[in-house]
């Protein structure tokens, strides 16, 4: 049992290392920025961001392309709930420094939680996305 877990653990680690979660990050950032544009941007937030969508992305085509690539990556974790959770935590961790304010952070988290469902995958159980920058120790 223990041996199998260690092997499973290593498999998850190598899956995470191989995975390109960047399209997921871009898709989510664009999604929350589009929502902000719809509801009116916070006048105090800095206007430019490295993830700020281009006019092409604002029409949604770029974002759906990111979503498709993101779903392909997440699909790799479908049979390992713990690994799926790790992937989502990694996305949250990678973006936590780029999110401006509590509201944007909550919005990002909400979209991130919905991501597996959007991809037609099962959301992981017992998965804590309340990640602080500084992170968790790796397994």
């Amino acid at each position: 049992r223990q041996q199998w877990e260690l092997q499973g653990d290593r498999r998850c680690q190598s899956q995470l290392e191989r995975a390109n979660l960047r399209p997921c990050e871009q898709h989510l950032m664009q999604k929350i920025q589009r929502d902000e544009d719809s509801y009116g941007r916070d006048p105090y937030s800095p206007s430019q961001d490295p993830y700020s969508p281009s006019p092409y992305d604002r029409r949604g085509a770029g974002s759906s392309q990111h979503q498709e690539r993101c779903c392909n990556e997440l699909n790799e974790f479908e049979n390992n709930q713990r690994c799926m959770c790790e992937a989502l935590q990694q996305i949250m961790e990678n973006q936590s420094d780029r999110l401006q304010g509590r509201q944007q952070e909550q919005q990002f988290k909400r979209e991130l939680r919905n991501l597996p469902q959007q991809c037609g995958l099962r959301a992981p159980q017992r998965c804590d996305l309340e990640v602080e920058s500084g992170g968790r120790d790796r397994y």
């Epitope: 877990e5 939680r113 959301a123 992981p124 017992r126 998965c127 804590d128 397994y139």
Partner: antibody, heavy 123, light 110 residues
């Protein structure tokens, strides 16, 4: 009034068997996970087993797997713990608790507890 | 030996505050939500905190929870004599597919 009531505890010999039951009144168990936790005299809490009320998921502590069986009966609002091959290490108060675990992005937490039933193992 | 480590005892002055820590690993606390329980002498455990920081209704605000990395903490401020009890943390362990409880911390109010 939400309440969980355990029964079935008592004295048994080593290698014997007991069946504990937990009945609820005041809420519908079928929407929840249920859990058994035990506490040996003067010791801390130790989780024993979880069951999703439709019976589709069961998890056990390693040291009881194969000896203990958790089951549920939604029509009776009951959760049972069948204990076989009892040893002195199983001697404890057994609590049943409602587990607030949801289907995703939440943790296990035990928000309603029974009063506990004492299991004594002695020859 | 519980896989979640808590101090066996802590004490604090009446009206003061104490923090009880619960440390684990990536496969339990680092990955999953933590809950906290209070067990008064001769009584049934009572849920104090769930999903790291959430208080069930009826639990006073002087109880607060937090989590950083693989350590969770329960802080009790405005200590009262009735807070004297055993406190337990718990979380799921993804390696063991099991819920783990900490060994418990006995709180004494001076």
């Amino acid at each position: 009034q939400k309440q969980l009531v355990e029964s079935g505890g008592g004295l048994d010999q080593p290698a014997g068997s007991l069946k504990l039951s937990c009945k609820d009144s005041g809420f519908t168990l079928s929407t929840f996970y249920m859990t058994w936790v035990h506490q040996a005299p003067g010791k801390g809490l130790e989780w024993i087993a979880n069951i999703k009320q439709d019976g589709s998921e069961k998890d056990y502590l390693d040291s009881v797997r194969g000896r203990f069986t958790i089951s549920s009966d939604n029509t009776q609002n009951m959760v049972d713990l069948e204990m076989n091959s009892l040893t002195a290490a199983d001697m404890a108060i057994y609590f049943c608790a409602r587990n607030g675990l949801q289907d995703s992005y939440s943790g296990d937490f035990f928000d309603h507890w029974g009063q506990g039933t004492l299991v004594t193992v002695s020859s | 030996q519980p896989a979640l480590t808590q101090p066996s005892s802590v004490s604090g002055a009446l009206g003061g505050s104490v923090t009880i820590t619960c440390s684990g690993t990536g496969s339990n606390i680092g990955h999953n939500y933590v809950s906290w329980y209070q067990q008064l002498p001769g009584s049934v455990p009572k849920l104090l905190m769930f999903d790291n920081t959430k208080r069930p209704s009826g639990i006073p605000e002087r109880f607060s929870g937090s989590k950083s990395g693989t350590t969770a903490s329960l802080t009790i401020s405005g200590l009262q004599p009735e807070d004297e009890a055993d406190y337990y943390c718990a979380t799921w362990d993804a390696d063991l597919s099991a819920v783990l409880f900490g060994g418990g911390t006995k709180l004494t109010v001076l």
